[in-house]
């Protein structure tokens, strides 16, 4: 199942994805693709990073977080209804079949016709249950023994609506996180 995120037409969408580098500067290649994560790589790649930088992207897709610290959350500028669908964030951990794959569902809603409120909502996130280690409430940590030396932490938030700026900021601490090393 996918975590679901929402944005309105004309706004920017934010799809969170995180990992923890084994050491500062030890970046892991990441790809973002439109469509569910396939067995290998990303289908319909919209952005890619390598051990050094962002080395491929298409128009309107960019990383607004600190990708050098493992924040590889995707920003999609000025979304349209056609941007709805599943997106894959793939952390390309060295080794056979070590990749971590996260499917995120983006739902685009038509723009409101009524006058915008004082504080505009950029996006909302909804999902019934979270796994987190970031101290934002009850947390579970799951270690996958099948992936050597990797602790997998999946992070999301319980938020039907982002009603205040604190929640908007907290969304940066949501998404999918893995620890490498």
């Amino acid at each position: 199942s996918e975590v679901e995120y929402r944005a309105e037409v004309g706004q920017n969408a934010y799809l969170p994805c995180f990992y923890t580098p084994a050491a500062p500067g030890n970046l892991v290649p990441v790809c973002w693709g439109k469509g569910a994560c396939p067995v290998f790589e990303c289908g319909n790649v919209v952005l890619r990073t390598d051990e050094r930088d962002v080395n491929y992207w298409t128009s309107r897709y960019w990383l607004n977080g600190d990708f050098r610290k493992g924040d590889v959350s995707l920003t999609i500028e000025n979304v349209t209804l056609a941007d709805s669908g599943i997106y894959c964030c793939r952390i390309q951990i060295p080794g056979i079949m070590n990749d971590e794959k996260f499917n995120l569902k983006l739902v685009i809603k038509p723009a409101k016709v009524t006058p915008a409120p004082t504080r505009q909502r950029d996006f909302t996130a909804a999902f019934p249950r979270m796994l987190t280690t970031r101290g934002h409430g009850p947390a579970e940590t799951q270690t996958l023994g099948s992936l050597p030396d990797i602790n997998l932490t999946q992070i999301s938030t319980l938020a039907n609506e982002l009603r205040d700026s604190r929640l908007a900021n907290d969304l940066r601490d949501s998404g999918a996180t893995i620890r490498i090393g």
Partner: antibody
Framework: QVQLVQSGAEVKKPGASVKVSCKAS????????MNWVRQAPGQGLEWIGD????????KYNQKFKDRVTMTTDTSTSTAYMELRSLRSDDTAVYYC??????????????WGQGTLVTVSS | DIQMTQSPSSLSASVGDRVTITCLAS??????LAWYQQKPGKAPKLLIY???SLADGVPSRFSGSGSGTDFTFTISSLQPEDIATYYC?????????FGGGTKVEIK
């Protein structure tokens, strides 16, 4: 403390090659990319490329890729940048510089003193 | 390559003035902008990295803001020792590219 000490000024003829060295100390040489940046007289800064000493992986600015080679000697913590087929517009100060996140995610940024390369017939 | 457009190319201000320099990226670069100070005959010195973070040992009168494509560098109260040329640099996608520089002088 961290230091990057570069080789001395060079005067070269057009068509010749120059090899500039950069000796690093005060940090773990293999942990950070070594960048090379140049600055023509009275002009701005231009990135030439970088190399990661732990495996020799390098990335060059397309503008220089056919003429530049970057290498490192981890035994002496020294980086080298060789530029071939020199032209008069290669006259510049060449800097080595290393940057990136260090321990505790403190940003690490150090530059050599610069090496003036003059290309003249 | 990502182009960095810096403005103004030069400015003259009085001691104590607030000085603002802007840098515009041709494509979004997230937070990955650095600001350097360079004095004649010297290597560049890092002031700001990741758009807003002050480098170690840099006075707090220097600050940076912005993300995406639009960035601003501010000296809150210009001091005589701030006379230099300032460069922005993107560190989002190589080749790392610099702005054309802003020469700051005292009136």
């Amino acid at each position: 403390q961290v230091q990057l000490v570069q080789s001395g000024a060079e005067v070269k003829k057009p068509g010749a090659s120059v090899k500039v060295s950069c000796k690093a100390s005060g940090y773990t040489f293999t942990d950070y990319y070594m960048n090379w940046v140049r600055q023509a007289p009275g002009q701005g800064l231009e990135w030439i490329g970088d190399i990661i000493p732990n495996n020799g992986g390098s990335k060059y600015n397309q503008k220089f890729k056919d003429r530049v080679t970057m290498t490192t000697d981890t035994s002496t913590s020294t980086a080298y940048m060789e530029l071939r087929s020199l032209r008069s517009d290669d006259t510049a100060v060449y800097y080595c510089a290393t940057w990136g996140y260090g321990s505790s995610y403190r940003w690490f940024d150090y530059w050599g003193q610069g090496t003036l390369v003059t290309v003249s017939s | 390559d990502i182009q960095m457009t810096q403005s103004p190319s030069s400015l003259s201000a009085s001691v104590g003035d607030r000085v603002t320099i802007t840098c515009l990226a041709s494509q979004p670069i997230g937070i990955w902008l650095a600001w350097y100070q360079q004095k004649p005959g010297k290597a560049p010195k890092l002031l700001i990295y990741a758009a807003t973070s002050l480098a170690d040992g840099v006075p707090s009168r220097f600050s940076g803001s912005g993300s995406g494509t639009d960035f601003t560098f501010t000296i809150s109260s210009l001091q005589p020792e701030d006379i230099a040329t300032y460069y922005c640099q993107q560190l989002y996608s190589s080749p790392w590219t610099f702005g054309g520089g802003t020469k700051v002088e005292i009136k």
